[in-house]
């Protein structure tokens, strides 16, 4: 069961909670009673587990990836899992912790000496088989910024958004991935109707910037479902 999968090992000597927004006295918010910690790929908290549901890797933290917690598990149940360390098995780059990438099913170090050709070959490998993930859904493929001395500028080849400079994200462009601008208010965005649908995009857009969400443009509410235009809008 999900509970036993996620809650089977207790973690002792937890690190202090990560900095996060705690509630202020008198507000309708209280501080989180537990913070997520990885135990292999099992989640624990100070008092109990708090699975964080996701549909794609980008919804998880930089040290996490999105997948079903059990092999062959319900595709509708996907949570953020702790990234895999060096020499651990993997099926895609996002499963490996920053500083590593997935090569031949194993997380390996992405040191400074890799040739660009090998990086691009890895990207092509990843997208050549869209069903090489744990749950049959394609995922955004990522690689650590350690690969480059500087953050990628717009148009640079990348494998994860942290490869790119501030204000850019790593998105698919034909069969590789490049740094593209994070979307601004009013720009057209892609709202994925079903999980995994981003795997079909040859020209992937970035997500909307902070403070924005991808919503149907006001004057397009009457349009048919397939032709609805989504733009980045403030709340």
């Amino acid at each position: 069961t999900l509970n036993s999968v996620l809650n089977s090992n207790a973690i002792k000597n937890l690190p202090p909670p990560l900095g996060g927004a705690a509630g202020h006295p008198g507000s309708a918010v209280s501080a989180a009673p537990g913070i997520l910690y990885p135990g292999g790929n099992k989640y624990q908290t100070i008092d109990n587990y708090q699975p964080y549901p996701c549909a794609e890797d980008e919804e998880c933290g930089t040290d996490e990836y999105c997948a079903s917690p059990t092999r062959g598990g319900d595709a509708g149940v996907q949570i953020c899992l702790a990234c895999r360390k060096r020499r651990k098995r993997c099926m895609r780059h996002a499963m490996c912790c920053p500083g590593n990438y997935c090569k031949n099913g194993i997380c390996v170090s992405s040191d400074q000496n890799h040739f660009r050709g090998e990086i691009e070959e890895t990207i092509t490998e990843s997208f050549g088989n869209d069903h090489s993930t744990l749950d049959g859904y394609s995922r955004r493929t990522t690689l650590s910024s350690k690969m480059y001395h500087t953050k990628g500028q717009e148009g640079s080849v990348c494998l994860r958004s942290s490869d790119c400079a501030s204000g850019l994200c790593c998105a698919r462009h034909f069969w590789s991935k490049i740094c593209k601008p994070v979307l601004k208010e009013g720009q057209v965005c892609t709202k994925h109707r079903r999980k995994g649908s981003h795997g079909l995009e040859i020209f992937q857009r970035c997500y909307c910037g902070e403070g924005l969400s991808c919503r149907i443009q006001k004057d397009h509410h009457q349009a048919s479902n397939s032709s609805r235009l989504h733009t980045c809008q403030r709340h």
Partner: nanobody, 125 residues
Framework: QVQLVESGGGVVQAGDSLSLSCAAS????????MGWFRQAPGKEREFVAA????????VYADSVKGRFTISRDNAKNTVYLQMNSLKPEDTAVYYC??????????????????WGQGTQVTVSS
Amino acid sequence: QVQLVESGGGVVQAGDSLSLSCAASGRTFSSYAMGWFRQAPGKEREFVAAISWSGGSTVYADSVKGRFTISRDNAKNTVYLQMNSLKPEDTAVYYCAAGNGGRTYGHSRARYDYWGQGTQVTVSS
């Protein structure tokens, strides 16, 4: 800052249904995963259900699977918990939580940062 206010709690008989709502104020509600947790007297707060920002992924505690349904309406900044076939052991204070995750914000861990004050649900036998 996201503020969460739960409503819909009350006293019901075993086998009855109840629907909880959690209204969120603040920006970017739709970029947060949302969860429901509960705490019975003398017990630790426990996870009940959660839903991803897009609604594409939901996860439930084994104890409520098949009886409870979590959903969200991003246009209304609201998350819901439909509770059917309630049992006395479902009696607890139910809390809504917002999860601030995502590489977008540079967090190393997706986590629940914001919590409501809770709404009491009492199921009598």
